[in-house]
Amino acid sequence: AILGRSETQECLFFNANWEKDRTNQTGVEPCYGDKDKRRHCFATWKNISGSIEIVKQGCWLDDINCYDRTDCVEKKDSPEVYFCCCEGNMCNEKFSYFPEMEVTQPTSNPVTPKPP
């Protein structure tokens, strides 16, 4: 393990659509992936008239958007489905929404992340 980084080996699992997807509804998911690649946890949810409905929680493959995030926080402004990812065992047990101020989209595609 690399010092200062929390490795993700398992995440909270939840699937609201478990019957259709033929999975368990809830539990703990061991995270698998290519050797040397990082692993993360994620949570997705909807906000239906102020009521939070969890859609899915589980393991997420190596993603630079999730690096060094110990907390699962959605920063996009009013997405249709909220998504957050994080590093560390079961880090997706809690999740939150803190939208960043949106900057006007540049005329060409940014390769770097959109600035806050």
Epitope: G58, I64, E80, Y82
Partner: antibody, heavy 115, light 111 residues
């Protein structure tokens, strides 16, 4: 093992639409992104866009904005890329690839646009 | 975002080492360790060789290595073999807040 299997070759007329599918197996489909890339005959790779397989959130290259739609059906672990208002210069092999690193690729789908 | 810049072609003899460059800007290649390298044989799908500038994809020969200096990423192939003859592309991570872009590709000829 991880596999992405794409739908078969298509021949379309200018102005029509095409929908290419990409069926994933060997990993949890909802654990990453699916990216779409195309390659015109004798040309390089061109990124079209990406879809978050669990949330359905998409990002499209500006060039394709308004003409491309990426969707997925998590119950059958399949991603879709639909390109509308086809032109002859859309003739290309279209690839899907797993994750932001493009670590596994589909075999490609040849789309020919010809009148 | 304009494509990353690669040489159109490079060549080398069996056993030699070759390096392919991929030049971007201070806001993409220069700022982040997220450049990848792909190998593509004619009529085949691309294959990830190096990701995150210098990490080897599982199952890839250790003759392939990646590095970065300033705004330029490089792929080095040592002990060149006939089967290394292919097109090589650099590209960036794409997903979430990141948009993808590829280099124009480099044709490697093994003499």
């Amino acid at each position: 093992q991880v596999q992405l299997v794409q739908s078969g070759a298509e021949v379309k007329k200018p102005g029509a639409s095409v929908k290419v599918s990409c069926k994933a197996s060997g990993y949890t489909f909802t654990s990453s992104y699916i990216n779409w890339v195309r390659q015109a005959p004798g040309q390089g790779l061109e990124w079209m866009g990406t879809i978050n397989a669990v949330s359905g959130s998409t990002s499209y290259a500006q060039k394709f904005q308004g003409r491309v739609t990426m969707t997925r059906d998590t119950s059958i672990s399949t991603a879709y890329m639909e390109l509308s208002r086809l032109r002859s210069d859309d003739t290309a092999v279209y690839y899907c690839a797993r994750s932001g690193w493009f670590d596994y690729w589909g075999q490609g789908t040849l789309v020919t646009v010809s009148s | 975002q304009s494509a990353l810049t690669q040489p159109a072609s490079v060549s080398g003899s069996p056993g030699q080492s070759i390096t392919i460059s991929c030049t971007g800007t201070s806001s993409d290649v220069g700022s982040y360790n997220y450049v990848n390298w792909y190998q593509q044989h004619p009529g085949k799908a691309p294959k990830l060789m190096i990701y995150g500038v210098s990490k080897q994809q599982s199952g890839v020969s250790n003759r392939f290595s990646g590095s970065k200096s300033g705004n330029t990423a490089s792929l080095t192939i040592s002990g060149l073999q006939a089967e290394d003859e292919a097109d090589y592309y650099c590209g960036t991570f794409a997903g979430g807040s990141y948009y993808g872009v590829f280099g124009g590709g480099t044709k490697l000829t093994v003499l």
